[in-house]
């Protein structure tokens, strides 16, 4: 393969130094080998993004409006499979527990804070507000276009996109995936949602010039605002209960 790049993750460094001269790609910031035939985990992508910010690389600087969760960007700890570790800490020894999408689900504490497990986010609600159009999109056409997008671009199994709701100009995409439902090769809804979020913001993680091209019966879908809500298999443990928006 003369073109040794990672089509699914531009935040990688690739070479042909592996066995048999096979192209291998490692995530920036962690040096973890990634599978370029599928999506890279959100944890490794966040880590790469933070390392790129530190090194001053301009192509991955987040936009001023980038809100991943209520605490903003952080440099996460990932396990050997690229998943978020249950406990995350910053440089000042402030720690907190996160869910499987890396969003804080407890109050912040010190290094004595215990996080027994990574609580799975089994329901992601993506809320989009589209730019005004001459007339509302046909709900059925919009539904099939978004299902096609998640299946083709993010390789998310159709059963994990449970519903598309539409009340002009608000679109809601519901992703649901229990731990028991996720097969070995299945894309995680957390990763699909993150890739979609970056695509919507014009910060695609895919290689090449081909960006997001969402259109409903020839009418382009332009998104003005995105909100992402994460619902976990266990309720969050804040002293004041709240829903986590991203």
């Amino acid at each position: 393969q003369s073109n040794c790049t990672c089509p699914t993750n531009k935040m990688t460094v690739c070479d042909t130094n592996g066995p048999g001269g096979v192209c291998q790609c490692r995530a920036m910031g962690s040096q973890v080998l990634v599978d370029c035939s599928t999506l890279t985990s959100k944890c490794l992508l966040l880590k790469a993004r933070m390392s790129a910010r530190k090194s001053g690389r301009s192509l991955v600087m987040p936009s001023e409006h980038a809100i991943l969760d209520n605490d903003g960007l952080y440099d996460p700890e990932c396990d050997d499979k690229g998943r978020f570790k249950a406990r995350q800490c910053n440089q000042t020894s402030v720690c907190w527990c996160v869910n499987s999408v890396g969003v804080r689900r407890t109050d912040k504490g010190d290094q004595s804070l215990r996080c027994d497990e990574v609580v799975r986010t089994h329901h992601i609600l993506i809320e989009l507000r589209h730019r005004p159009t001459d007339r509302a999109f046909n709900h059925s056409d919009l539904d099939s276009e978004l299902r096609r997008l998640f299946q083709e671009r993010y390789k998310l199994h159709p059963s994990f996109l449970s519903a598309v709701h539409y009340e002009e100009p608000t679109i809601q995409i519901e992703l649901r995936q229990n731990a028991s439902q996720k097969g070995l090769r299945d894309v995680d809804i957390a990763d699909a949602a993150y890739y979609f979020e970056r695509d919507i913001k014009g910060e695609s993680l895919f290689m090449g010039r081909r960006g997001l091209d969402v259109q409903v019966r020839g009418e382009p879908l332009h998104v003005e605002r995105t909100l992402i809500y994460y619902l976990d298999e266990k309720p969050p443990q804040f002293s004041m209960k709240r829903l986590t928006a991203g």
Epitope: Q1, N3, T5, P7, T8, C23, C36, S37, R148, L149, E152, R153, F206, M207, G208, R209, R210, G211, D213, Q215, R217, G218, P220
Partner: antibody, heavy 126, light 103 residues
Framework: AVTLDESGGGLQTPGGALSLVCKAS????????MFWVRQAPGKGLEWVGV????????NYAPAVKGRATISRDNGQSTMRLQLNNLRAEDTGTYYC???????????????????WGHGTEVIVSS | ALALTQPSSVSANPGETVKITCSGS???YGWFQQKSPGSAPVTVI????KRPSDIPSRFSGSTSGSTGTLTITGVQADDEAVYFC????????FGAGTTLTVL
Amino acid sequence: AVTLDESGGGLQTPGGALSLVCKASGFDFIDYDMFWVRQAPGKGLEWVGVINRSGSYTNYAPAVKGRATISRDNGQSTMRLQLNNLRAEDTGTYYCARGACTHCWDADSAGYIDAWGHGTEVIVSS
Amino acid sequence: ALALTQPSSVSANPGETVKITCSGSSGSYGWFQQKSPGSAPVTVIYWNDKRPSDIPSRFSGSTSGSTGTLTITGVQADDEAVYFCGNADSSGTFGAGTTLTVL
């Protein structure tokens, strides 16, 4: 049935320009990426270029880059290939083809072609 | 552009199983049958393993790593043709073609 009909081929002079048209029927043209593929006499298939559903994105093979323009008219279900500064090596049969995966990250890949036209022959000679 | 490698020729007796491989890209593979030079190609497999509705079920496709495989189970005389693979991550590429001879 999916039908793709190419037209516009024939004898062309070196340095000139050609315009090929692909007329599609039997499917919702607006929902598919479209390709041009050519085959020189006695040779293999050569990917020429691709255009996405809306026409906002095109990609071309190095051999035609800077000389080729692919456009489409979704209302008429047609795609066009304009090729300028013709050379002898542009001789061959030009096929219009349909891409099955418009959102895939590697959607420019010939691996997604699921239907072909019958082809139109182009001869570049003085 | 990526170079796709496939064997120049394979042969088989009627009823046998034939496998044609194509390597060189991690993208999605397609397989195209051309029965005579200048005749239009026919897609027998696209998107790694999808088969158009008018293609017999004896044609199947699979991928492993950067290699795609076209399998014809119970090859018939009518399957004699040149088979091209197609792929590439960022722009289209075709293999040079494999001539299938049915003995």
